[in-house]
């Protein structure tokens, strides 16, 4: 009998956020289905997301295992067992990913505003030290874990009353910031990795403003 | 054309084990799907358990816990141990190779029956 119409996989892309990182592809599947497989430059090939009609894989348990590596992965294409097809040895379809360092790559998530405390004309703001996938003596570490001092935040804050921001810099979880008293603020923060040459900054946090149940007030 | 043949059918009685093995006449890429379908008499033919070349295995619901697939890459072998057996799993069980096609084997009959 003849042969299938297997397509190679197309338009692969990583999907990545604090380290949560999905493989997607294309196309939907007809009659085939598809194996991921990953792989460090000098590691071997690891199956995953096997024998599946998904379009998408998550290869989030392998690339936390060490982050700063570059990972490649493949996705193969075979006709679904169903399909009679009978056709000379040949090895199956498969396309490769770009490569992909999450350390380098991973998109930062958007932060939040954990709480901000005034005492008199200072402000403390405290960002949410978000916990990712990435494990090291089996407990999660967090972003501020994994990334050290390349991970800066950047708040941003103005006045109720006015449109007019000011930025602060930090490279912990919280900002001290001078304020007028009797003014209320609201802030804003952005995750920030200087050093980067791709996805740079997050998206910035929801803005909390002073008179809200986050903040707490002190002469 | 890459020939696949399979051995260790018979009849058992229910509740009983068979292994079946498949080997391929050429040397198959750890690249290549290998595995077993069944076809039961009058019906269509069903997958069964799939492997990858490292060893990542699927299951068909009807099978997860009674059977198990194996393979040995360097003998370009595949197994299937069949335990608990019961009638419903009387059926041609065809080995299969899926690289750029699919390659089937012949078939070999399994019986379960008292």
């Known amino acids: 009998s003849g042969t299938t119409n297997t397509v190679a996989a197309y338009n692969l892309t990583w999907k990545s956020t604090n380290f949560k990182t999905i493989l997607e592809w294309e196309p939907k599947p007809v009659n085939q289905v598809y194996t991921v497989q990953i792989s460090t430059k000098s590691g071997d090939w690891k199956s995953k997301c096997f024998y599946t009609t998904d379009t998408e894989c998550d290869l989030t348990d392998e690339i936390v295992k060490d982050v700063k590596q570059t990972y490649l992965a493949r996705v193969f294409s075979y006709p679904a067992g169903n399909v009679e097809s009978t056709g000379s040895a040949g090895e199956p379809l498969y396309e490769n990913s770009p490569e992909f360092t999450p350390y380098l790559e991973t998109n930062l998530g958007q932060p939040t505003i954990q709480s901000f405390e005034q005492v008199g004309t200072k402000v403390n703001v405290t960002v949410e030290d978000e916990r990712t996938l990435v494990r090291r003596n089996n407990t999660f570490l967090s972003l501020r874990d994994v990334f050290g001092k390349d991970l800066i935040y950047t708040l941003y804050y103005w006045k109720s009353s006015s449109s007019g921001k000011k930025t602060a810099k930090t490279n912990t979880n919280e900002f001290l910031i001078d304020v007028d008293k009797g003014e209320n603020y609201c802030f804003s923060v952005q995750a920030v990795i200087p050093s980067r040459t791709v996805n740079r900054k997050s998206t910035d946090s929801p803005v909390e403003c002073m008179g809200q149940e986050k903040g707490e007030f002190r002469e | 054309q890459v020939q696949l043949v399979e051995s260790g059918g018979g009849l058992v009685q229910p509740g009983g084990s068979l292994r079946l093995s498949c080997t391929a006449s050429?040397?198959?890429?750890?690249?290549?799907?290998m595995g077993w379908h069944r076809q039961a008499p009058g019906k269509g033919r069903e997958l069964v358990a799939v492997?990858?070349?490292?060893?990542?295995?699927h299951y068909a619901d009807f099978v997860k816990g009674r059977f198990t697939i194996s393979r040995d890459n360097a003998k370009n072998t595949v197994y299937l141990q069949m335990n608990f057996l019961r009638a419903e799993d009387t059926a041609v069980y065809y080995c299969?190779?899926?690289?750029?096609?699919?390659?089937w084997g012949q078939g070999t009959m399994v019986t379960v029956s008292s």
């Open positions: 492997i990858s070349g490292d060893g990542v295995t």
């Open positions: 299969y190779a899926a690289g750029r096609w699919n390659h």
């Open positions: 050429e040397t198959i890429s750890s690249t290549y799907i």
